[in-house]
Amino acid sequence: VPRWRQQWSGPGTTKRFPETVLARCVKYTEIHPEMRHVDCQSVWDAFKGAFISKHPCNITEEDYQPLMKLGTQTVPCNKILLWSRIKDLAHQFTQVQRDMFTLEDTLLGYLADDLTWCGEFNTSKINYQSCPDWRKDCSNNPVSVFWKTVSRRFAEAACDVVHVMLNGSRSKIFDKNSTFGSVEVHNLQPEKVQTLEAWVIHGGREDSRDLCQDPTIKELESIISKRNIQFSCKNIYRPDKFLQCVKNPEDSSCTSEI
């Protein structure tokens, strides 16, 4: 008789999840020799321990503490790039600007990027059929709690000038409900962070509007200012040219506005 299984509204655990996490950990330590002290088997065990045999709507930040401890990493606190709804460009940027880091350039972010996972209460099985959706099912699911935890820690570590890349093509350029808007903004430390600089990325080729004047950007400025952090904003009119100029800053066409 097949055992009854909870049907959630979201996609199930990514196939080959355990193998992918372990492989990514090994890759990360190969690429980043300063993280060679990390035992990838222990990392996987801690990751698994955070959600296996637990109800997938009852996950807490505490569940992830053993993993957080194993994945402790020091990144230059003044070289942090946050992003919202524009992950690919942010990652393309840090691939070129090697001294800057997104959350996914850290071990824990790299391990979980684009993956979904959940377990079931009282069984050691991973649920490959379905996992809770943040909106339709519950917010305290394994994936959401993981990203909330690592995002908070990442924002808390930031100092000096923190950059954030925002998608100027979205109706809400700054969205209070995004991870950036709901977690990272509120966990920047005013005693360490001097300025939050927003880069608003334009989508349209002919879009010459000043999106820094957008009402949602003004809302972000207000939230940040109330937290005693300065705010600045730049339009990136040509993201392709922007990346090209990061690669080749001496190019003559890079002196004009991008």
């Epitope: 080959r16 193998e19 492989a23 990514r24 090994v26 890759k27 190969e30 020799p33 060679r36």
Partner: antibody, heavy 120, light 107 residues
């Protein structure tokens, strides 16, 4: 069984570009970093760079920066190394290589090598 | 970049002899040194990883030791099939760097 199979020998003129492929089998391509190593005739081994096929992230040794492009095609499980502005000193055997799970950070897996001859 | 100075560049020994090759790193590389054997026209073959660990299937006559900056590779009893060039490589820091190689011949 893990296998790395490289494309055949190439003869190129100075200034040209060569693109070498490394097709893998026996493991999940995106699970490992792919490295490239150069060996000039009668010379030692020189690490050129790596690619993480899952994300397309690369790192290239300073000596080769600006001339080497490393790419990966996850649909065909193939890594590529392109070397441009060829000169005679680029005449060498080029290898793709990867680490294993029980080999620290050494390279237990190598392609058979691709000989590139640069001659006018 | 870390320099790996390997010596000797070549040696000649008799079958059954003990052969020792050394590699000196220009800075501390912990135990992140690997040793490779390469025969003419073939790809290098991993023998020793992390200074002293024999890779799967490698005969017990091959061994390695050392940490920090000084590393040693030993063939306890040289066999005819061991004629090859041997390389050390540091895998501690990018870029990975190799020693210049030691060509081993039979007397």
């Amino acid at each position: 069984e893990v296998q790395l199979v490289q494309s055949g020998a190439e003869v190129k003129k100075p200034g040209a570009t060569v693109k070498i492929s490394c097709k893998v089998s026996g493991y999940t391509f995106t699970d490992s970093v792919m490295n490239w190593v150069q060996q000039a005739p009668g010379k030692g081994l020189e690490w050129m760079g790596w690619i993480d096929p899952e994300y397309g992230r690369t790192d290239v040794a300073e000596k080769f920066q600006g001339r080497v492009t490393i790419t990966a095609d996850t649909s065909t499980d193939t890594a590529y190394m392109e070397l441009s502005s060829l000169r005679s000193e680029d005449t060498a055997v080029y290898y793709c290589a990867r680490t294993g799970y029980n080999s620290g950070y050494g390279f237990p897996y190598w392609g058979q090598g691709t000989t590139v001859t640069v001659s006018s | 970049d870390i320099q790996m100075t390997q010596s000797p560049s070549s040696l000649s020994a008799s079958v059954g002899d003990r052969v020792t090759i050394t590699c000196k790193a220009s800075q501390n590389v912990d135990s992140d040194v690997d040793w490779y054997q390469q025969k003419p026209g073939k790809a290098p073959k991993l023998l020793i990883y992390k200074a002293s660990n024999r890779y799967t299937g490698v005969p017990s006559r091959f061994s390695g030791s050392g940490s920090g900056t000084d590393f040693t590779f030993t063939i306890s009893s040289l066999q005819p099939e061991d004629i090859a060039t041997y390389y050390c490589m540091q895998s501690n820091t990018h870029p990975r760097t190799f020693g210049g190689g030691t060509k081993v011949e039979i007397k």
